[in-house]
Amino acid sequence: LTCLGGFASPGPVPPSTALRELIEELVNITQNQKAPLCNGSMVWSINLTAGMYCAALESLINVSGCSAIEKTQRMLSGFCPHKVSAGQFSSLHVRDTKIEVAQFVKDLLLHLKKLFREGQFN
């Protein structure tokens, strides 16, 4: 995930309880990871901007058969107004770098923790 800093406002923000639950699930994934997450599957990195939740879902939805991230995929769909299908890239504007799912989850988790600490939620 790119653009961890350098933006003034994250745009619209979620309720704190929802953000907290998503963070808890990502923490659970990273702590329980033994073998390479999703067999080392690669996903598109995303820009951590206002549209990052839909972008994150659009990236992760293309990983199939990985039970470890299925709950995260379902949860992210609550943050996105519209249904997201595999191969859909309306929010994922820039597709230039692929990273492992494990790194994607770690980067997303770090960013969400930062938003939570800064009180960027409803």
Epitope: A18, M75, G78, C80, H82, K83
Partner: nanobody, 119 residues
Amino acid sequence: EVQLLESGGGLVQPGGSLRLSCAASGFTFSDYTMTWVRQAPGKGLEWVSTVNPDGDSTFYRDSVKGRFTISRDNAKNTLYLQLSSLKTEDTAMYYCTKASLITWPQSPRGQGTLVTVSS
């Protein structure tokens, strides 16, 4: 044109239950995340609960967790909110919105249904 029609509100005693419904039309209901919000008398709009398009992921504000249950029937284009163990502080106008956890403050909503919890 998006149309959302809430129903099921009413006067109920503390500890009682109600089931709110929201009939949706004018869009492909099963393609959208849906959210319930509420507005108490003299207060601002507050988020209550959200369900994803497939209905397999739900979120609740802390104060209603364990008491309220959001669900949807995509075949009937209907969103539900089961209210249980109601408290006086749950008194509000309840609105359904075609909105996610992010977009709920500025999304279209119906005319609402009034829930009054009083003894």
